[in-house]
Amino acid sequence: STTKCTVSHEVADCSHLKLTQVPDDLPTNITVLNLTHNQLRRLPAANFTRYSQLTSLDVGFNTISKLEPELCQKLPMLKVLNLQHNELSQLSDKTFAFCTNLTELHLMSNSIQKIKNNPFVKQKNLITLDLSHNGLSSTKLGTQVQLENLQELLLSNNKIQALKSEELDIFANSSLKKLELSSNQIKEFSPGCFHAIGRLFGLFLNNVQLGPSLTEKLCLELANTSIRNLSLSNSQLSTTSNTTFLGLKWTNLTMLDLSYNNLNVVGNDSFAWLPQLEYFFLEYNNIQHLFSHSLHGLFNVRYLNLKRSFTKQSISLASLPKIDDFSFQWLKCLEHLNMEDNDIPGIKSNMFTGLINLKYLSLSNSFTSLRTLTNETFVSLAHSPLHILNLTKNKISKIESDAFSWLGHLEVLDLGLNEIGQELTGQEWRGLENIFEIYLSYNKYLQLTRNSFALVPSLQRLMLRRVALKNVDSSPSPFQPLRNLTILDLSNNNIANINDDMLEGLEKLEILDLQHNNLARLWKHANPGGPIYFLKGLSHLHILNLESNGFDEIPVEVFKDLFELKIIDLGLNNLNTLPASVFNNQVSLKSLNLQKNLITSVEKKVFGPAFRNLTELDMRFNPFDCTCESIAWFVNWINETHTNIPELSSHYLCNTPPHYHGFPVRLFDTSSCKDSAPFE
């Protein structure tokens, strides 16, 4: 091909090539052609004769102002036609007359202000019609019943002001899953407008200034329709009462989106008419008081999003939003509750009472004063089968005994990013008989005891990053009870002292993060009592991160037991010489990181075993000694390996001898070196 199109598997991509005409030298068997972002003004039908197999044609983002009816005659198999972001203004009855197999027609962002006659009458197979971002002032798309298979009609960002039954009755035989009317200036829903449509399942009216009054009228018009999904995001619905959604009583609505409405008052029984509702989006509102009956009637809701729904109006404590006790008691089927980023004063004793199916609860950054978790804090969740609880970013400073004793089903507990500073007696976790993961990273300080985790032997993941960990060197180890642990993160704790039995018995451990500590002394031969082999017995360890620990020595047998190790990170240490057989048992190693150390020599006897099956190597920024003895074997290995070595040309530079300083390692000439073959 003379054009720079890329062709792969019968798909031709000719986008962004400043083309002014359709290429005439592409394979004739292509089924998908992408001509977007070019300078096409016309699509001459003759140019497509050779591409009769096309099922998808995308000519979006060009300057096409007219379409030849013969185009589809040349493309009898065409199913998807995308004309978005062009300059079409008129559609005649002939325009798409031959496009009888189309399932998708995209006309978004053109200049179509009016639809005359019946340009879509032949599209009996059309499923999606996108006319959004045009200048349409009405929903009139024809004068006779048509588009019987249409499922999605997208009319957002037009200038539609009223919905009229006489304009929508062309869809009398259609089942619309999605009628998208967002970002219009609709002020009127004429009687019967939605009944004119055969069946309407989804209606989207986001960014339409409805307000409470017009919302009420809309719902009355939706009565006795097939509506399932209704989206009214950012529709200036500032208050709701027990009449707002009355019309929906005669529907089976399952999804309602009221997000971004600055909703201030949710009156009692506002949603009493929605017993079938399953998904309810209320995020980004401004509810000042949730009354005990505000959510009454929502017996089938499974998902409720209240993120940033309760925000304080001013600095005054008196302006904090209120949630009455028992407000959620009606939500018997609720499984997922998101209450992130709110300004709720605290958790009352019956705040969550009645949520007998709740499995996921996010309370991240939800409270203004949740400093201490007591044995009463979560009493209202005692009868909830909660599996996941997120309590991050709440400035929690203390967890008292039995704080979670009500949550016997809990599997994941996230307490990260708080201000917890205390001795962990182990009583904090009492009752967590099914716990799988505890995330405690990014807190103030945690002092461990032998019983810190004695009551949670089921724990598989424990995250203790940057918590100023104290007493980690006690014996028996605080981690001794955690025989099911697979992930342990102890990074960023400035740990300097640990015992060789710190990880004893953790035979299932797969991931160990110890980066950013101060463990260098433990591996020094001069260490009193000799090096401390704290990794012994971890026969199932897959990932080991020891970055930034100041290591300048590695004992020869330190990785001896790590037969399944796949990834090891020893970057940002001070390693210079590694013992000969240090990696001998790492037969499964896939990734080795030794960047920013002081390695001068990469010899076969040290690195041969480690490099055997590597897929990724990072030894950037080491002061390589470019002599035969030091790197000849390495250079030959580099030039023959399939291992990925990022920035090999730029960041693997010789440091010595002086005449090689700054010279790329891979270009070192090994031809004069003896016995440097990388593979035997």
Partner: antibody, heavy 119, light 107 residues
Amino acid sequence: QVQLVQSGAEVKKPGASVKVSCKASGYTFTTYWIHWVRQAPGQGLEWMGEINPNNGRINYNEKFKTRVTMTRDTSISTAYMELSRLRSDDTAVYYCARVGVMITTFPYWGQGTLVTVSS
Amino acid sequence: DIQMTQSPSSLSASVGDRVTITCRASGNIHNYLAWYQQKPGKAPKRLIYNAKTLADGVPSRFSGSGSGTEFTLTISSLQPEDFATYYCQHFWSTPFTFGQGTKLEIK
């Protein structure tokens, strides 16, 4: 199943030493600490200390620290408790015990070894 | 060191009686308390751990309660095989001291 089998009864003279063994089976010996508890005739139970079979690290009850030595031989899955400078009030049944999955209890006990100190 | 004080030191009761034994710690041991039953010439047998968790194979007539410094072992309806000596033991910090024992005798 987990079993702790102790050595037989011993009679010792005051001032002598006694070494009681505890052979473990049914689990990996090096993964659980072994505790020693004694019981004088007609008296209560007294915790003496614990040993980590993996590295030999020990936590003693201060009361016995100067006289007791706890050791282990991992090759034969056996822990030992040696008590020196025996006195008549050291006459007792000496038990080894082991924690379970829950480390705050002793579900497993040896059958006990009676040590009699008599001149 | 934490001292454990058991009361009473001995107790006479009849089959079918409800019996309560108390154990007091000299410091806060949270719920790290175990109860054992011992019969003459035998090693102790674990009944309850973590103050209230019943060990496997132990009849449900045994129950434990308490937290902090005050703990109780209750036998709801004494059976002939329950006549023995009962000990509490804490597991908060070494040394893991035992109570002096409560001898439960047949009336």
